[in-house]
């Protein structure tokens, strides 16, 4: 009788890992092996298939085999008996292509209100995603375990942290690699779950914010508690997406080490031209806080977002407000290359209530005022470019008298 | 693989100093932490700092600081220690550790024991 | 500084025996707690890493859990090498510190 060749032969790439499969043409015939020859591209002659030669179940292993995953390779594959059956050739493909990408391996550390993830690709060192190592980027899923309200996060590297969790509560994750400059997106990994800590004594300080002032940068923060003492560190952003490498090596700024306020000063020459991530943490001798929320902060828009100078011109029912270039140190105004935004908040100088006006224009009415009262305005510029994404600080409050009654015209 | 390769025994004076060196190999040290612990004689152990061979820059335990100094040399991938105004309380060995991923120790130096006595 | 206290300072098991010994932190550390053990005349060895982490190559028999203040590490059925100290250490701030140490003999 003779042999049937194998049909729907599949070939799955996860990784560095070549699997093959197949089906039995035959069922009724025992004792049969299978063998697969392949053939590069612009080659006649067919090689035997290291790992698939003489298999009796319908699946094998070819990941031996060193392939230029970006070659196209064809196979084909036989039955053998006694006799052999005709070659069955399975299309063509190129390994870059038909791969997928492997759940990744996860490692979680957890905080009381935080949880860190660190992420590496799932195969170390792996040969088809060789060139691409930096690109990957992961999205995760979270939920707490008591709930199942799933939460996605989207574009993260290899160490993420989530911020903003409740204290002794477990919550489960898996995470997923992509690889959009090829349209790849891998499978998740196995669920991983982490109980957050009991609540710390210390809360991390919060509402970091980044200025410039002459040729200094001043990082400030809020801090619940009086008698403290401060740390500020920094890393370079692009070490978060470095794969593999989970240890960070956080560096000091001298200026800010054991500050006594919820401020530090320093030259702003102390940072190259880059984007950095800060973080500050609080001690008052005996416990420790765990690190803030972690800011990013660059320098080429920090140089330039200054706070908005303006002008008050003071009516009786409305303040008219002429916003100008900043000025740097030597009272030179600053170019600004990019569109802004300007966010103005004014108040009754015996009151909190605050109002906000944001408005394109540089000359902007505010209206509804009292004669003769105090305001007081404050504003800060946005940049409307949704990639940079960039606030100043608030400038310095102005405050004004309205003038009397029907001044207004 | 991975190795470290510490100096040999030391017997010191009271008040003079001890440098120990750790040589490294299978790694690029820049690319981590090299921590120095050490242990007295049946007691546990104590984490006296760490250098970035990268930049060198170091963390010293309040307890040593003003009297250990670590420093390193990336040419022959070796780091050092030196304690100075030695006492017979430092008499100890006298380990060196890689700080690897997550911050921990993952491989660690045969150790060096540095008596001191007058 | 972050004290660390490790319990029992002593411990006799036999073989098969499971064991815990619990490390107890003076502050909040997360998950930043490592185990080592060491035997006499030899370097400390990495056993356990971010509280619950296994060391590849260290055997399932070693497991690590809690986090904030408590943690510990067990050993579910004691083999006879496993006889020796050993050491928590916290790894979330500097100084980083040790526990006192565990030794576990033979009964």
């Known amino acids: 009788k003779n042999l049937k060749s194998p049909q729907k032969v599949e070939v799955d790439i996860i990784d560095d890992n070549f699997i093959l499969r197949w089906n039995r043409s035959d069922e009724s015939v025992g004792n049969v092996t299978f063998s697969f020859d392949y053939q590069k591209t612009g080659m006649d002659n067919w090689i035997k298939l290291s790992g698939c030669q003489n298999i009796t179940s319908t699946k094998c292993n070819f990941s031996s085999l060193k392939l230029n995953v970006y070659e196209e390779i064809k196979l084909r594959i036989r039955a053998e008996k006694e006799n052999t059956s005709s070659w069955y050739e399975v299309d063509s493909f190129t390994p870059f292509r038909k791969a997928q990408i492997g759940p990744p391996e996860v490692h979680l550390e957890a905080e009381d209100k935080a949880i860190v993830i660190h992420i590496s690709p799932g195969t170390k060192d792996s040969v088809m995603w060789a060139l691409d190592g930096l690109s990957f980027t992961y999205s995760l899923v979270i939920w707490k375990n008591s709930s199942g309200v799933e939460e996605r996060i989207e574009n993260i590297y290899s160490r993420h942290k989530i911020y903003k969790l409740s204290p002794e509560t477990t919550y489960c994750l898996k995470v997923k690699a992509a690889l959009l400059t090829s349209w790849k997106i891998g499978v998740y990994s196995p669920v991983h779950c982490i109980k957050t800590t009991v609540e710390n004594e210390l809360p991390p300080p919060e509402n970091i914010e980044v200025s410039v002032q002459n040729q200094n940068y001043v990082l400030k923060w809020d801090y619940t508690y009086a008698n403290m003492t401060f740390q500020v560190q920094w890393l370079h952003a692009f070490l978060k997406r470095n794969p593999g490498n989970h240890l960070y090596k956080w560096k000091q700024i001298p200026d800010c080490e054991n500050v006594k306020t919820t401020q530090c000063v320093f030259p702003q020459n102390v940072f190259q031209k880059g984007i950095y991530l800060l973080r500050v943490q609080a001690s008052d001798g005996n416990n420790t806080s765990f690190w803030s929320e972690e800011i990013k902060f660059d320098t080429e828009i920090q140089a330039f977002l200054l706070p908005p100078v303006f002008n008050i011109r003071s009516l009786s029912d409305s303040f008219h407000i002429y916003i100008g270039a900043p000025k740097q140190s030597g009272n030179t105004p600053v170019i600004q290359d990019y569109p802004l935004i300007y966010e103005i908040i004014f108040w009754e100088n015996t009151s909190n209530a605050e109002r906000k006006i944001i408005e394109k224009k540089t000359d902007v009415t505010v209206p509804n005022l009292k004669p003769l009262t105090v305001y007081c305005v404050k504003a800060r510029a946005h940049t409307m470019d949704e990639k940079l994404n960039k606030s100043s600080v608030f400038s310095d409050a102005v405050c004004e008298k309205t003038k009397p009654g029907n001044t207004s015209k | 693989q991975v190795q470290l390769v510490q100096s040999g025994a030391e017997v010191k004076k009271p008040g003079a100093s001890v440098k120990v060196s750790c040589k490294a190999s299978?790694?690029?040290?820049?690319?981590?932490?090299m921590h120095w612990v050490r242990q007295a004689p049946g007691q546990g152990l104590e984490w006296m700092g760490r250098?970035?061979?990268?930049?060198?820059?170091?963390k010293y335990a309040p307890k040593f600081q003003g009297r250990v100094t670590m420093t390193r040399d990336t040419s022959t991938s070796t780091v050092y220690m030196e304690l100075s105004s030695l006492r017979s309380e430092d008499t100890a060995v006298y380990y060196c550790?890689?700080?690897?991923?997550?911050?921990?120790?993952?491989?660690w130096g045969q150790g060096t024991l540095v008596t001191v006595s007058s | 500084d972050i004290q660390l206290t490790q319990s029992p300072s002593f411990l006799s098991a036999s073989v098969g025996d499971r064991v815990t010994i619990t490390c107890k932190a003076s502050q909040n550390v997360g998950t930043n707690v490592v185990w080592y053990q060491q035997k006499p005349g030899k370097a400390p060895k990495l056993l356990i890493y971010?509280?619950?982490y296994r060391v590849s190559g260290v055997p399932s028999r070693f497991s690590g859990s809690g986090s904030g203040t408590e943690f510990t590490l067990t050993i579910s059925s004691l083999q006879p090498e496993d006889f020796a100290t050993y050491y928590c250490?916290?790894?979330?701030?500097?100084?980083?510190?040790f526990g006192q140490g565990t030794k576990l003999e033979i009964k």
């Open positions: 550790a890689r700080g690897g991923n997550f911050y921990v120790m993952d491989y």
């Open positions: 250098i970035d061979p990268e930049d060198a820059e170091t």
């Open positions: 250490q916290q790894k979330n701030n500097y100084p980083y510190t």
């Open positions: 299978g790694f690029n040290i820049k690319d981590y932490y």
């Open positions: 971010s509280a619950s």
